[in-house]
Amino acid sequence: TIPPHVQKSVNNDMIVTDNNGAVKFPQLCKFCDVRFSTCDNQKSCMSNCSITSICEKPQEVCVAVWRKNDENITLETVCHDPKLPYHDFILEDAASPKCIMKEKKKPGETFFMCSCSSDECNDNIIFSEEYNTSNPDLLLVIFQ
């Protein structure tokens, strides 16, 4: 093994590491907050967000929220810590490399949300059932 450098005079308690001791770097996520969207009745959509941000904390993941009501459609793109709820929902799919939209119950609107943990993964949001691993046939294919 490589001998470590002389100990640096910084607070290592503030450094997030993975299981191998490597420093955990933050995600790069699309981060346009809430924008009007034309994404509707499609298997997948691009975010059309031109802002890619370095997430503030290494534990944060990329999130996209698609909402449709009587007046408009919006798409929200952000970084968020999966240990904390977002819009009152837990980010169940935070470890996924792709942003697979799942419908959530919200009164007065259609509400889909996804989270993912690869760079700019919330740029491409996927609604198509073929990606949804709650489909038992797909689970069979994956685990065969």
């Epitope: 470590p4 450098h5 450094i15 590491t17 191998n20 490597a22 420093v23």
Partner: nanobody, 116 residues
Framework: EVQLLESGGGLVQPGGSLRLSCAAS???????RMWWVRQAPGKGLEWVS?????????YYADSVKGRFTISRDNSKNTLYLQMNSLRAEDTAVYYC?????????WGQGTLVTVSS
């Protein structure tokens, strides 16, 4: 043996400029995306900027956007950070880093002090 050696820090007045360099060795530099990370005394790491392996995609923390420019010269295995319009809050130790490396194996960093 992976080595990252930062240089170019120093004392500069507010509004001034500095150019940091990082000489890399012991790994295939042109295959790796590279980061500039800083740590102010008693604070956590702040992710300043990242550049992809080819050097054609760059990203910045909001706090430095429009003032700092990351670049790299793959023929020299060197990473750069051009820092303009420096502010007191930019005072920190600046490290260059690559993915997958424990903090103890990072370089010593280079201290940037912005003060009048």
């Amino acid at each position: 043996e992976v080595q990252l050696l930062e240089s170019g820090g120093g004392l500069v007045q507010p509004g001034g400029s500095l150019r940091l360099s990082c000489a890399a060795s012991g790994f295939t530099f042109n295959d790796m995306r590279m980061w500039w990370v800083r740590q102010a005394p008693g604070k956590g790491l702040e992710w300043v900027s990242v550049i992809n392996a080819d050097g054609n995609r760059t990203y910045y923390a909001d706090s430095v956007k429009g003032r700092f420019t990351i670049s790299r010269d793959n023929s020299k295995n060197t990473l750069y950070l051009q820092m303009n319009s420096l502010r007191a809050e930019d005072t920190a130790v600046y490290y260059c880093a690559k993915d997958g490396l424990p903090f103890d194996y990072w370089g010593q960093g280079t201290l940037v002090t912005v003060s009048s």
